[in-house]
């Protein structure tokens, strides 16, 4: 956990963060693990420590090895290890597996490819992006902040994407490249205006006084994972938590049930020991997502217990 693999290419900048995180006020000391020799903090050195960051400007194959960082608080010292490997630049276009960052997946609706590790560097936009070593051109490709957006993603967009940027340190510029694979999901998810399956609009629910009653608010929001989707109950236009009646509580039912591939949510309203005054309330089932909000209203009515005597009179 506190040993982290980092890699880079010779003659490029490489910045490594201590895998042992601490508060910003804590000091961090860096050492060569093999020799226990302290790494300097002076920026004139090619390899130097800067707080929780270890900087190779630029990196050399001989820098490969394990580095120790010790994070010091007033009362605790905690150790982390950075396993650094610097590789020679490849002459051909192939990016070997050991230089690849984690694979990301995209779909028609979400096709962002983040440039790995870029948050560690002092860089300025725009990023340059390459696919299989070819510079990306055309209106479908947009370099935005630290990621690439591909419009109208197709299965042919799968492949290895390399981002290239310049790190600036005290006026000196250093090149950095990072590559990751991009795969395209076949199944296209989508989002719809919420559809409330239950209760029906203006439904009248029969309840017995003194008994418990359950109302289920069930809605579907589209297909696949939804970024924002919620169902909830309101009483007389007020959230359940704010209404202040401990007998009436809501709890999540089935979370994101993918029956027929649809993303649906349930919220169950539990009314304990139904009272006369509960019949006067307006119960609203609300379903909302990025498209908007849909509301179905329910009212309660008294269910008269069967009077067995009157049947035989």
């Amino acid at each position: 956990k506190f040993s982290k693999q980092s890699w880079g290419l010779e003659n490029e900048a490489l910045i490594v963060r201590c895998p042992r995180q601490g508060k910003p006020s804590y000091t961090v000391d860096w050492y060569y693990s093999q020799t226990n020799k302290s790494i300097p903090t002076q920026e004139r050195n090619r390899v130097f420590a800067s707080g929780q960051l270890l900087k190779f400007l630029p990196a050399a194959v001989a820098d490969s090895g394990i580095y120790t960082c010790i994070v010091r608080s007033p009362t605790f010292n905690r150790t982390g290890y950075a396993n650094v490997t610097i590789y020679k630049k490849q002459s051909d276009c192939n990016v070997p597996d050991y230089l690849m960052y984690s694979t990301v997946s995209g779909s028609e609706k979400n096709s962002k490819i983040y440039c790995p590790t870029i948050d560690l560097y002092n860089w300025t936009a725009p990023l340059e992006w390459f696919k299989n070593c070819q510079a990306l051109q055309g209106s479908r490709y947009r370099a935005h902040k630290s990621f690439l957006v591909i419009d109208n993603v197709m299965t042919e967009d799968a492949g290895d994407y390399t981002c290239k940027f310049i790190h600036n340190e005290n006026g000196a510029n250093y090149s950095v490249t990072a590559t990751r694979s991009f795969t395209v999901k076949d199944e296209q998810g989508f989002s719809l205006f919420p559809v409330i399956g239950a209760p029906a609009q203006n439904e009248i629910k029969e309840v017995e006084i003194g008994k418990n009653a359950n109302l289920t608010c069930s809605a579907c929001f589209g297909k696949g994972t939804q970024f924002l989707a919620a169902v909830l109950w309101q009483l007389n236009g007020t959230k359940i938590t704010d209404f202040g009646e401990p007998r009436i509580q809501q709890e999540e039912g089935q979370n994101q049930s993918f029956s027929n591939g649809l993303a649906c949510l349930d919220m169950v309203l539990r009314i304990a020991d139904v009272k006369e005054e509960d019949l006067l309330l307006q119960y609203d089932c609300l379903a909302l997502n990025l498209h908007g909000l849909r509301r179905h209203t329910v009212r309660l009515s008294r269910k008269n217990p069967i009077d067995h005597h009157s049947i035989y009179c």
Epitope: K23, S73, T75, F76, R78
Partner: antibody
């Protein structure tokens, strides 16, 4: 010197409520995560709840989820535990403790503890 | 939830003897393990953090070792004030959990 002082314990009936407080001093309260840990009579230690320094994230043991609420007032250097729907099995000494290191979403050890306050749930 | 199992439940030793307490995790906790000492009527006291580092003010006779799932707390030579209950705690993830404790008593 770091000090944590719990208060608010006592005898309460099942289904009742109590609010525990923990007054902190001797350190920068607002930057450290704080914990509630309990110990039933003659038993071991059980983590109850924790809250990050800015109050932005809270965590609960399954046994108290939905019944207990942890909160903090950094302007008063005070940690709270609101306990509702109390059960007999909640009977314990409740300790407040400091996590001196934790970063967002992670935990560390508890280096300072209060003396504890006894909560007894009984009819 | 990660379960920590301490053994033995009770350790009967004399002052000056060596105490070896064990803590086993149901899955790897790397080195995210601490040891605490608790005396009757008192709050727990932190002894060891990150499996092997002594907390500030803890005597050198206390040492911790181990990584992954198996951990040991060693008291090299028991002093009278060391007779207490010892707990291990993991903090690799939520929920943090404690072992059930080992009582070190005077033989």
């Amino acid at each position: 010197e770091v000090q944590l002082l719990e208060s608010g314990g006592g005898l309460v009936q099942p289904g009742g409520s109590l609010r525990l407080s923990c007054a902190a001093s001797g350190f920068t309260f607002s930057v450290d995560s704080m914990f509630w840990v309990r110990q039933a009579p003659g038993k071991g230690l059980e983590w109850v709840s924790s809250i990050e320094g800015n109050g932005g994230a809270t965590y609960y043991a399954d046994s108290v989820k939905g019944r207990f609420t942890i909160s903090r007032d950094n302007s008063k250097n005070t940690l709270y535990l609101q306990m509702n729907s109390l059960r007999a099995e909640d009977t314990a000494v409740y300790y407040c403790a400091r996590d001196p290191w934790s970063t967002e979403g992670s935990f560390f050890v508890l280096d300072y503890w209060g003396q504890g306050t006894l909560v007894t749930v009984s009819s | 939830e990660i379960v920590l199992t301490q053994s033995p439940a009770t350790l009967s030793l004399s002052p000056g003897e060596r105490a070896t307490l064990s803590c086993r995790a149901s899955q790897s906790v790397d080195d995210d393990l601490a040891w605490y000492q608790q005396k009757p009527g008192q709050a727990p006291r932190l002894l060891i953090y990150d499996a092997s580092n002594r907390a500030t003010g803890i005597p050198a006779r206390f040492s911790g070792s181990g990584s992954g799932t198996d951990f040991t707390l060693t008291i090299s030579s028991l002093e009278p004030e060391d007779f207490a209950v010892y707990y291990c705690q993991q903090y690799i993830g939520a929920p943090i959990t404690f072992g059930q404790g080992t009582k070190v008593e005077i033989k």
